[in-house]
Amino acid sequence: GPVPPSTALRELIEELVNITQNQKAPLCNGSMVWSINLTAGGFCVALDSLTNVSGCSAIEKTQRMLSGFCPHKVSAGQFSSLHVRDTKIEVAQFVKDLLLHLKKLFREGQFN
């Protein structure tokens, strides 16, 4: 899909920082999501994995932001080929991995 502008990505990073930095209890009650290959996948794949989580207000804004980065509607399981060895991880781990991935992209100047 199209590369989001730097300002939108900064806002997504700030939201992921906010979630990670202020997490006082297990995120989304410890819900599990598919681990994905972020390098090969991207925003639509990340959204696909998080689409399986419902009723978790803490990540609703992240889900909306990812939707804005993905050019088409994503349905759960659409990108199953990019799941990492059918591995599930906690949402907190997923958010952390996504945050570090985006931080790395920024550091490499890909979205500046």
Partner: antibody, heavy 122, light 109 residues
Framework: EVQLLESGGGLVQPGGSLRLSCAAS????????MSWVRQAPGKGLEWVSA????????YYADSVKGRFTISRDNSKNTLYLQMNSLRAEDTAVYYC???????????????WGQGTLVTVSS | SYVLTQPPSVSVAPGQTARITCGGN??????VHWYQQKPGQAPVLVVY???DRPSGIPERFSGSNSGNTATLTISRVEAGDEADYYC???????????FGGGTKLTVLG
Amino acid sequence: EVQLLESGGGLVQPGGSLRLSCAASGFTFSSYAMSWVRQAPGKGLEWVSAISGSGGSTYYADSVKGRFTISRDNSKNTLYLQMNSLRAEDTAVYYCAKADFWSGTLWGFDYWGQGTLVTVSS
Amino acid sequence: SYVLTQPPSVSVAPGQTARITCGGNNIGNKIVHWYQQKPGQAPVLVVYDDSDRPSGIPERFSGSNSGNTATLTISRVEAGDEADYYCQVWDSSSDHVVFGGGTKLTVLG
């Protein structure tokens, strides 16, 4: 080149006060969270306090809460630590440290000052 | 509050691999950073974000983090690597930065 230069350390009696300063240069100071970290003689690193880039959020170790105040003046590129009601156990080298990424306090400290020694003794 | 547990000391012969562990409850969900500190000097960041290396840090330094243990690995250890090493995380439940107690790496010989 990033530089952090602490000052304000010295000898103070128990119950006394000191204000440490950390002059920063070589980066956009207001974009980064900053922290104070201390090290008592022969001991490990102990985090003291942190402040967000804007100064709107501050955080303190339990051992200093209510006695120390962290602040920053982004117009002067300077970080401060006001230390009141000092105790012998506050004796340490105090380092200021810069977060390695904008937004938040999750990050490692990629630059440190050389430290300033605070000695609390009668 | 959150506790990070490091072995007080690790000894290794030159040219061998040193592994320094940092234990913490579900530390794999946290972002871990590692520092090297030599006597009389300020700490230096050697690994950040679990496994990334700042520029200027040799490739011999690497990090990993999963489950309840983060690990700093130093391959082909040199005499100059002798120092204290500290792990660090942000603990969101207490809004505190937390350091491990430190590990003294001794290079034998």
